[in-house]
């Protein structure tokens, strides 16, 4: 029901279900190396791993799609862990006056569900 | 970048990036039929297809997995098309004292986003 | 507007470990890019860089005393934290905690805190 | 580690006159991004250091636009157009291309 209980205990093994995970990654990798200027190396957390069912269901929406998932799984994707909030980063990069700082709310996750 | 703009036309072919799609759930479907009296079918959207690169990014976030993901595959997942936003839905169930009319906010899908 | 204080004992015996708070108001200290950053100032002397932490736990150190530092951080607090082990009367000094854009732009300093080593 | 060179070592000056202060780095702190990966601070007697500038050129929030940072490579300059009574203090350049950021042994600029 509406009322069903997410699951936090995954019953895949440790670290397979949907959790946060920092990934390093360079100005280079993401293609930025020509418009930020610092800092030159991210800790980019993401949201990874398996949504077995009804683990860190995000609403009744991701409950249905776990159920439904398990009735049609041809027609209704699994849940995916996706953010659930983020944190704050701040980055210094060039503007058409100069250079800025500026704080982007979108960038690193904080933490994850599985939607 | 983070000025990336995310794209919405499908490179993979119509019906097959990430979209609304509508299905069809009775209540036993759901394991509502003990306590949800009304409506007895639900037309349910929901989130499906795939998300290839920058295709209807959610937001930054998303836009940096897509790029990661490309660069290294087993270690970051693709995006995933998830719900940008919900249509409540009135539900009448059964009470302790009776009857009731609710509306629920996070049940069905409105519209999707990769994230 | 961020403001930085800093906590600890003033005096330290030789062979030692000099702990340090740095307690972090008006803003948070779980962001991307930022490093909170301890610098130190002998007497009468320059500055020098010794480490700084993420917000992801990730830590710096300076090469020269890295056998010797632990920096670390509790977001629940808002608080950074600096150990120095097996002090010497070299290690007296004013320590400063400071927020940088990464391992630059240091725009907020504490005030500063005199350690001094000796017996 | 970077060596950071600062001179003079002091500075006397005299209010409304200009003032500069040199910094020299024993590698290029030139990104290939084209900025210079280099600060400066001002501590004044008894006070925490201050941002002044960063990478190389630009000024921090709040610092006058008498201060100016110039220079690429391994050479810079800091230029005070007009000194006044409260820019005292030891000023420092700092590199921030490599860890360990290192600071240069600081210029004491003290009135006449």
């Known amino acids: 029901s509406a009322h069903a209980h997410p699951r936090d205990s995954c019953p895949l093994g440790p670290g397979r279900c949907c959790h946060l995970e920092t990934v390093q990654a360079t100005l280079e990798d993401l293609g930025w190396s020509d418009w930020v200027l610092s800092p030159r190396q991210l800790q980019l957390s993401m949201c990874v791993g398996e949504c077995p069912h009804l683990y860190r269901s995000a609403n009744t929406h991701a409950q249905i799609k776990a159920r439904l998932h398990g009735l049609q799984p041809d027609k209704v994707p699994a849940p995916c862990c996706v953010p659930s909030s983020y944190t704050p980063v701040v980055l210094m990069h060039r503007t058409d006056s100069g250079v800025s700082l500026q704080t982007y709310d979108d960038l690193v996750a904080r933490g994850c569900h599985c939607a | 970048s983070a000025h990336a703009h995310p794209r919405d036309s499908c490179p993979l072919g119509p019906g097959r990036c990430c979209h609304l799609e509508t299905v069809q759930a009775t209540l036993e479907d759901l394991g509502w039929s003990d306590w949800v009296l009304s409506p007895r079918q639900l037309q349910l959207s929901m989130c499906v297809g795939e998300c290839p690169h920058l295709y209807r990014s959610a937001n930054t976030h998303a836009q940096i997995k897509a790029r990661l993901h490309g660069l290294q595959p087993d270690k970051v997942p693709a995006p995933c098309c998830v719900p940008s936003s919900y249509t409540p839905v009135v539900l009448m169930h059964r009470t302790d004292s009776g009857v009731s009319l609710q509306t629920y906010d996070d049940l069905v899908a409105r519209g999707c986003h990769c994230a | 507007q961020v403001q930085l204080q800093e906590s600890g004992p003033g005096l330290v015996k030789p062979s030692q470990t000099l702990s340090l708070t740095c307690t972090v108001s008006?803003?948070?200290?779980?962001?991307?890019?930022?490093?909170w950053t301890w610098i130190r100032q002998h007497p009468g002397k320059g500055l020098e860089w010794i480490g700084a932490?993420?917000?992801?736990?990730?830590?710096y150190y300076n090469p020269s005393l890295k056998s010797r530092v632990t920096i670390s951080v509790d977001t629940s607090k808002n608080q950074f934290s600096l150990k120095l082990s097996s002090v010497t009367a070299a290690d007296t000094a004013v320590y400063y905690c400071?927020?940088?854009?990464?391992?630059?732009?240091?725009?907020?300093w504490g005030q500063g805190t005199l350690v001094t080593v000796s017996s | 580690d970077i060596v950071m060179t600062q001179s003079p070592l002091s500075l006397p000056v005299t209010p409304g006159e200009p003032a500069s202060i040199s910094c020299r780095s024993s590698q290029s702190l030139l990104h290939s991004n084209g900025y210079n990966y280099l600060d400066w601070y001002l501590q004044k007697p008894g006070q925490s250091p201050q941002l002044l500038i960063y990478l190389g050129s630009n000024r921090a929030s709040g610092v006058p636009d008498r201060f100016s940072g110039s220079g690429s490579g391994t050479d810079f300059t800091l230029k005070i157009s007009r000194v006044e009574a409260e820019d005292v203090g030891v000023y420092y350049c700092m590199q921030t291309l490599e860890l360990p950021p290192t600071f240069g042994g600081g210029t004491k600029v003290e009135i006449k």
């Open positions: 932490i993420a917000y992801s736990g990730s830590t």
């Open positions: 400071a927020r940088g854009i990464e391992y630059q732009h240091f725009d907020y």
């Open positions: 008006g803003g948070s200290i779980s962001s991307g890019g930022i490093y």
